[in-house]
């Protein structure tokens, strides 16, 4: 009689997650008699998969009735296979007794076990940085088998290359998680800017996983203060305009000093945006020249998303004239009959910008 | 280890029926066939029919097949053999036997049910 | 339906001497290098207990004095040193088709 021999076909079985598994093995004789047991893993530590005499599998069932005369199939099915039955199974034949007696193992079958990987997370800065920095985008993804995996990045459909990525862990594991920093350079058009990771993966059937970010949520785009005035109405008042240009985001709060006295705060709020994402915003303030002796010091003090207040100053000039009586020293926004003549002179600026 | 624990003996008039059982435990009890088997007195032994407790598909010995029925309660892991129609030359001791190789043999034996059927 | 007889009827042997009994099936039974023959043991007041498998594998725990052999329609047990506890009677079984029983050797010491 030939000598039993316990044959394992396939060295190894790749499946997907939540699918079955089919693990083969075959004996070439029907002596001597006794079980099959499937193992995960050899040596004292080894795990019982499958007993054919006894215990409960509820995951696993034979391919061929055991009970079906003069069975040599010994294959097994397990069923909703998940990442963490990755391993390698030996179908193990034991020869009838008390206890029964290892005989002969099959040379192994290694399971692999395809598991998509998470969608991409991507995370950009805690705080928001300015036009010609360089910023940090994380992107996440976890859960994934086998190990290898393609990440890229784009900013608006452009490739990006300064990035840095890690797969762990580095030995063998049920699954992995992938884990790339990238470096983007911001310029002031990038509020609408978006970067992409995108995830490459065998389980994936070509169409990768992709994470976004805004860089509307990492950047800050400071305001340009311009001044303009218009000339001396007949009512001796001046319109003067802080106009503040392309910023981002919208939260500012706008002040006007006169000589250094505050005269008005103003919040911006419900601002239309321009193309590019940013902001403009104009304030207006109405001097009265008649209710001034000397020139007058304007400044318009931005506060921008919490920065250091950005100031634009600028005197208006007065020339002398009669003081009439009961008239206001200083008028915002009143009118007065008193005449006069004012110059406009426009103050270096004062922009102070704080960059994290 | 394998133990088939057998009901205890019977007696039975001419025309009745009987129904032995037979517990199995140490095994998974669906993986393997159970067979009945019969001895009378003094005589030797006689195959009656066997079930694969997995499906309930049955093979029977044609002198039984029309008196005897055998089923399977597996939340129990218990196998019983019917018999109908009772005739004095039915007294015998009844085995239930597990067949573990799948070869239609019988590897584990019961240690039998004594029917006897006298009027 | 196959039918297995078996010779002698009964046989008395002296301890340590060597018994043979025989089995002939109606038929053959054999296929594919199996031979679907197996032998019994059955002491009085016990159940019988399976000695050999397919015509000559030793079940697990029987001692090897006890041997069979044959093939096709004729085997053979073989005890090739009879010990007292081996007075008991002997019975052969075909699974070639559905199980039978040859009618039992009767195996006794001289």
């Known amino acids: 009689e030939e000598e039993l021999q316990v044959i394992q076909p396939e060295k190894s079985v790749s499946v997907a997650a939540g699918e079955s598994a089919t693990l083969n093995c075959t004996a070439t004789s029907l002596i001597p008699v006794g079980p099959i047991q499937w193992f995960r893993g050899v040596g004292p530590g080894r795990e019982l998969i499958y007993h054919q005499k006894e215990g409960h599998f509820p995951r696993v069932t034979p391919v061929s009735d055991p009970t079906k005369r003069n069975n040599m199939d010994f294959s097994i099915r397990i069923s909703n296979i998940t990442p963490a039955d990755a391993g390698t199974y030996y179908c193990v034949k034991f020869r009838k007794g008390s206890p029964d007696v290892e005989l002969k193992s099959g040379a192994g079958t290694e399971l692999s076990v395809r598991a998509k990987p998470s969608a991409p997370v991507v995370s950009g800065p805690a705080v928001r940085a300015t036009a010609e920095h360089t910023v940090s985008f994380t992107c996440e993804s976890h859960g994934f088998s086998p190990r290898d995996i393609t990440l890229k990045w784009f900013k608006n459909g452009n490739e990006l290359s300064d990035f840095q990525t890690n797969v762990d862990p580095a030995g063998k594991s049920v699954s992995y998680s992938i884990r790339s920093t990238a470096r983007v350079v911001l310029t002031r058009r990038d509020v609408h800017s978006q970067v992409i990771c995108e995830v490459a993966h065998v389980t994936l059937q070509g169409d990768p996983l992709r994470g976004t970010a805004n860089l509307s949520e990492a950047i800050r785009v400071p305001p340009f203060l311009e001044f303009t005035q218009q000339s001396m109405r007949a009512d001796n008042q001046v319109n003067v305009t802080c106009q503040v240009m392309k910023f981002y985001p919208q939260r500012l709060q706008l002040t006007w000093l006169e000589n250094g006295n505050v005269s008005r705060t103003e919040m911006a709020s419900a601002l239309p945006e321009n193309k590019d994402g940013t902001y403009n915003w104009t304030s207006w303030l109405l001097v009265n020249v008649s209710a001034h002796r000397d020139d007058v010091k304007l400044t318009c003090q931005v506060e921008h998303d919490g920065q250091p207040a950005v100031n634009k100053s600028f005197s208006v000039k007065v020339s002398a004239h009669p003081k009439e009586q009961g008239s206001n020293t200083a008028a915002e926004n009143t009118g007065t009959n008193e005449r006069g003549s004012s110059d406009y002179k426009d103050d270096d600026d004062k922009h102070h910008h704080h960059h994290h | 280890q394998v133990q088939l624990v057998q009901s205890g003996a019977e007696v039975k008039k001419p025309g009745a029926s009987v129904k032995v059982s037979c517990k199995a435990s140490g095994y998974t009890f669906t993986n393997y066939w159970i067979n009945w088997v019969r001895q009378a007195p003094g005589q030797g032994l006689e195959w009656i029919a066997m079930i694969d407790p997995s499906d309930s598909e049955t093979h029977y010995n044609q002198i039984f097949k029309d008196r005897a029925t055998l089923t399977t309660d597996t939340s129990t892991s218990t196998a019983y053999m019917e018999l109908r129609s009772l005739r004095s030359d039915d007294t015998a001791v009844y085995y239930c036997?597990?067949?573990?190789?799948?070869?239609?043999?019988?590897?584990?034996w019961g240690r039998g049910t004594l029917v006897t059927v006298s009027s | 339906d196959i039918v297995l007889t078996q010779s002698p009827d009964s046989l008395a042997v002296s301890l340590g001497e060597r018994a043979t009994i025989n089995c002939r099936a109606s038929k053959s039974v054999s296929s594919s290098g199996y031979n679907y023959i197996f032998w019994y043991q059955q002491k009085p007041g016990q159940p019988p207990k399976l000695l050999i498998y397919l015509a000559s594998n030793l079940d697990s725990g029987v001692p090897d004095r006890f041997s069979g052999s044959g093939s096709g329609t004729d085997f053979t047990l073989t005890i090739s040193s009879l010990q007292a506890e081996d007075v008991a009677v002997y019975y052969c079984q075909e699974s070639w088709e559905l199980p039978t029983f040859g009618q039992g050797t009767k195996l006794e010491i001289k």
């Open positions: 036997a597990m067949d573990y190789g799948s070869l239609y043999a019988m590897d584990y």
